[in-house]
């Protein structure tokens, strides 16, 4: 299934998507939509680019903050709410080719949890579970095969998140 990315309410979420312009600088249209990629295009479009720039955003919370001109079309959603949870489609609309590149990613927005820290735990979040934590502006994305690691429940995620944050560790955005 699609890779999950986790963000806390009020934080920024980062959903990775990229392609390699060929030749370099030869950009193609891209759309981001809320909901799995449909048969064509994107449904419930939140952001759309043309061959030069972003030309359609449904809200000022949606941004492409990566190097758009090098094919980094990762979506940043600012100040996420629980309503932002769900599957998003990044569709790279390659002209002259019969098939667009379709990428479905899942955003899970969680409420900030207040958990008593256990400072002895020093463990890399990305090896703890097959979901990616997303807390803002970092990047680039780290790729990981979904389902290749044991799953954990949200309580464990809360605990790991807070323990790492409280111990000063950096939580990488994926």
């Amino acid at each position: 299934s699609e890779v999950e990315y986790i963000a806390e309410v009020g934080q920024n979420a980062y959903l990775p998507c990229s392609y390699t312009p060929a030749p370099p600088g030869n950009l193609v249209p891209v759309c981001w939509g809320k909901g799995a990629c449909p048969v064509f295009d994107c449904s419930n479009v939140v952001l759309r680019t043309d061959n030069r720039d972003v030309n359609d955003r449904t809200s000022g919370r949606y941004w492409l903050k990566g190097d758009f001109h090098k094919g980094d079309v990762s979506l940043t959603i600012e100040n996420v709410t629980l309503a932002d949870s769900g599957v998003y489609c990044c569709r790279i609309q390659i002209p002259g080719i019969m098939n667009d590149e379709k990428h479905n990613v899942k955003l899970v927005v969680i409420k900030p949890a207040k958990v008593t820290p256990a400072p002895t735990l020093q463990r890399d979040l990305t090896s703890a579970f097959p979901r990616m934590l997303t807390t803002g502006e970092h990047g680039p994305a780290e790729t990981q095969t979904p389902g290749s690691l044991p799953d954990v429940n949200l309580t464990q995620i809360f605990t790991l998140t807070n323990e790492l944050r409280d111990s000063g560790a950096t939580i990488r955005t994926a």
Partner: antibody, heavy 114, light 107 residues
């Protein structure tokens, strides 16, 4: 809600050209993608192709040399033309649209026979 | 083209019972699968998209699952109006291709 209605002849002779019309209400054919799909007597469904909001087309390679999909935005209609038909083209033809092929016409049944 | 192998081609089940239909794609279609119900004289009706998402207005008796090359479709608590032919569709790659269909009858 989008509604589609197919129209055209019910009988065509082999080697002739088939022309079908899809009349669309509830949406403009200057947006989205507009498809043709057919169902053969043995129940097999085949995707034939589309015309989209900009007038770009895609045709199933199995039909490429014989098929043409066009549109008339002023009439809000799009069309299927299939050349050099044979008895193998006997089928029910559907016009279809929607994010996941949500909207289908009722279909028009075509028999190719001499 | 991506061939979709659907089975069984027909099945018969009791009212209130459960049926399962499967589709196997020749290659990974990344969950880009829809399921349709077709009754004579009508256009096919979308039931499920993206493998498991129920289309608006479709009863929760219908469900789908799968990933990679293997997909399945279930109807629980069969009702008389479920008599129809059911198809899977892969929309991952053009040309989009349908399964061969499963004709459902009620005993």
């Amino acid at each position: 809600e989008v509604q589609l209605q197919e129209s055209g002849p019910s009988l065509v002779k082999p080697s002739q050209t088939l022309s079908l019309t899809c009349s669309v209400t509830g949406d403009s054919i200057a947006s989205a993608y507009w498809n043709w799909i057919r169902k053969f007597p043995g129940n097999k469904l085949e995707y034939m192709g589309y015309i989209n909001y900009s007038g770009s087309t895609y045709y199933n390679p199995s039909l490429k040399s014989r098929i043409s999909i066009t549109r008339d935005t002023s009439q809000n209609q799009y069309y299927l033309q299939l050349n050099s038909v044979t008895t193998e083209d006997t089928a029910t033809y559907y016009c279809v649209t929607g994010d996941y092929f949500d909207y289908w016409g009722r279909g028009t049944t075509l028999t190719v026979s001499s | 083209d991506i061939q979709m192998t659907q089975s069984p081609s027909s099945l018969s089940a009791y009212l209130g019972g459960k049926v399962t239909i499967t589709c196997k794609a020749r290659q990974d279609v990344r969950k880009n699968i829809g399921w349709y119900q077709h009754k004579p004289g009508k256009g096919p009706r979308l039931l499920i998209w993206y493998t498991s998402t129920l289309q608006s207005g479709i009863p929760s008796r219908f469900s789908g699952s799968g990933s990679g090359r293997d997909y399945s479709f279930n109807i629980n608590n069969l009702e008389p109006e479920d008599i129809a032919t059911y198809y899977c569709l892969q929309y991952d790659n053009l040309p989009f291709t349908f399964g061969t269909g499963t004709k459902l009858e009620i005993r």
